[in-house]
């Protein structure tokens, strides 16, 4: 699941090597349909503008990437596939490569932190539910620990 | 909306000053109910463990904070409020302070980036919908710009 990862995945020492290969695979898959859509695109304006690139390079990079992958997989490609079986086949291949990239980025989770759940929070919720009424007392009694967590988080963010 | 922020909010030069004040307000509000829940909590084990603090300090800090605020506001406090009007009043005050903290963190969006939407992506989706069929052709024709965005994002993430 998205929240499951090992320390090895976390470190991702292998990742930089595979990165250019994944992007190359995406570019190659796209080249199979590029001419078709280039011919069909009659408009001069740019859809993916510089402001999108800036979001990719800023605090919202993870969200931008996550949302754009979803946008292509859910909104664009299914509509684009309607242009015949050959195009559909190539787009399926392109979509699979995009999903593989997302899966690898999730696994090496510093690349897509916004898609990962905190395992510690999941554990807190699970323990809370098991404890029933006592869970409420305990969670409220430990609210100051939560404040300490907030403080630690904010101190780290202040660094930037 | 969560995706709306100005350059000023983005820089948040004012924020460090207000931070300790907000945390102090939270601690003060909590002190009003602490003894009550301390007496009620009969269990020795810790709910908010060190692993939670580690998540707050790591890649998943934003998610951990966001989920834990939600957890307290939606799951813990409503159940805790059932212990009479006085407790409810104090908890309402504590909850409001927690919501205010979240609102300020969202506004100064580098503190809660995982809760912000990319305005550029929203714009892409909006333009895509307006263009109808031409939107599909344009989005597919510009898929290589998207790959370039992914590449830039990954290069910047290579940092850590």
């Amino acid at each position: 699941s998205r929240g499951q990862y090992s320390r090895e995945d976390n470190n991702c020492t292998h990742f930089p090597v595979g990165q250019s290969h994944m992007l190359l695979e995406l570019r190659t898959a796209f080249s199979q349909v590029k001419t078709f859509f280039q011919t069909k695109d009659q408009l001069d304006n740019i859809l993916l503008t510089d402001s999108l690139m800036q979001d990719f390079k800023g605090y919202l990079g993870c969200q931008a990437l996550s949302e754009m992958i979803q946008f292509y997989l859910v909104e664009v490609m299914p509509q684009a596939e309607k242009h015949g079986p050959e195009i559909k086949e190539h787009l399926n291949s392109l979509g699979e490569k995009l999903k593989t990239l997302r899966m690898r980025l999730r696994r090496c989770h510093r690349f897509l932190p916004c898609e990962n759940k905190s395992k510690a929070v999941e554990q807190v919720k699970s323990d809370f539910n098991k404890l029933q009424d006592q869970g409420v007392y305990k969670a409220m009694n430990e609210f100051d620990i939560f404040i300490n967590c907030i403080e630690a988080y904010m101190m780290i963010k202040m660094k930037s | 909306s969560r995706g709306q922020y100005s350059r000023e909010d983005n820089n948040c030069t004012h924020f460090p000053v207000g931070q300790s004040h907000m945390l102090l307000e939270l601690r003060t509000a909590f002190s009003q109910v602490k003894t009550f829940f301390q007496t009620k909590d009969q269990l020795d084990n810790i709910l908010l463990t060190d692993s939670l603090m580690q998540d707050f300090k790591g890649y998943l800090g934003c998610q951990a904070l966001s989920e834990m605020i939600q957890f307290y506001l939606v799951e813990v406090m409503p159940q805790a409020e059932k212990h009479g009007p006085e407790i409810k009043e104090h908890l309402n005050s504590l909850g409001e302070k927690l919501k205010t903290l979240r609102m300020r963190l969202r506004r100064c969006h580098r503190f809660l980036p995982c809760e912000n939407k990319s305005k550029a992506v929203e714009q892409v989706k909006s333009d895509f919908n307006k263009l109808q069929d031409q939107g599909v052709y344009k989005a597919m024709n510009e898929f290589d710009i998207f790959i370039n965005c992914i590449e830039a994002y990954m290069m910047i993430k290579m940092k850590s």
Epitope: - | A152, M155, M158
Partner: antibody, heavy 119, light 106 residues
Framework: QVQLVESGGGVVQPGRSLRLSCAAS????????MAWVRQAPGKGLEWVAS????????YYRDSVRGRFTISRDNSKNTLYLQMNSLRAEDTAVYYC????????????WGQGTLVTVSS | DIQMTQSPSSLSASVGDRVTITCKTS??????LAWYQQKPGKAPKLLIY???PLQAGVPSRFSGSGSGTDFTLTISSLQPEDFATYYC????????FGPGTKLELK
């Protein structure tokens, strides 16, 4: 090792043209976005133009857009800069550089070629 | 366009000194900043990218820090080969270079 070697510089009159070349070796040229950066005598660095790895997209600074054209031939491992309608303010050492990834930093630079625009 | 300033514009120092050069940008560029070293008649050499990681092969006496609009390049103990001009470079929105800091031998 990565090597970038520029050529084609020289003295040219205002309004005339010049074509710079950059021969790349030591890396897979077609896997990298490339750029031209210039430096006027005794001055700082100024980005001129960039091109994506497959030559689909080109980007220019405002002062050269419409006059300069960046291009590449991946089969020859060569980057080009066609400079038309040259002006005195274009006088500079022109460096060919490799982008580490799209729209990010430049990790390797050539030694540069001097272009002098003078009547 | 994003404007960049570097300070000082020049400085004199001795071998073994600790030197700090700062770079300021006119708007938030997050960590999209690189540092280059250039010697007379030579090409610029990449030292640091993404504000702090060291480019492979660059001595560890060089370090970078900062985020947003304020960045720093530090040389912990100057060596004779470090006397050169240093440029910062933002790549968040387009590409801009700082005006440079000339580091001379005292």
């Amino acid at each position: 090792q990565v090597q970038l070697v520029e050529s084609g510089g020289g003295v040219v009159q205002p309004g005339r043209s010049l074509r710079l070349s950059c021969a790349a070796s030591g890396f897979t040229f077609s896997d990298y976005h490339m750029a031209w950066v210039r430096q006027a005598p005794g001055k700082g660095l100024e980005w001129v133009a960039s091109i994506t790895l497959d030559a689909t997209y080109t980007y220019y600074r405002d002062s050269v857009r419409g006059r300069f054209t960046i291009s590449r031939d991946n089969s020859k491992n060569t980057l080009y800069l066609q400079m038309n309608s040259l002006r005195a303010e274009d006088t500079a050492v022109y460096y060919c550089a490799r982008h580490r990834g799209f729209s990010v930093w430049l990790d390797y630079w050539g030694q540069g070629t001097l272009v002098t625009v003078s009547s | 366009d994003i404007q960049m300033t570097q300070s000082p514009s020049s400085l004199s120092a001795s071998v073994g000194d600790r030197v700090t050069i700062t770079c300021k940008t006119s708007q938030n560029i997050f960590e999209n900043l690189a540092w280059y070293q250039q010697k007379p008649g030579k090409a610029p050499k990449l030292l640091i990218y993404n504000a702090s990681p060291l480019q492979a092969g660059v001595p560890s006496r060089f370090s970078g820090s900062g985020s947003g609009t304020d960045f720093t390049l530090t040389i912990s103990s100057l060596q004779p080969e470090d006397f050169a001009t240093y440029y910062c470079h933002q790549y968040y929105s387009g590409y801009t270079f700082g005006p440079g800091t000339k580091l001379e031998l005292k």
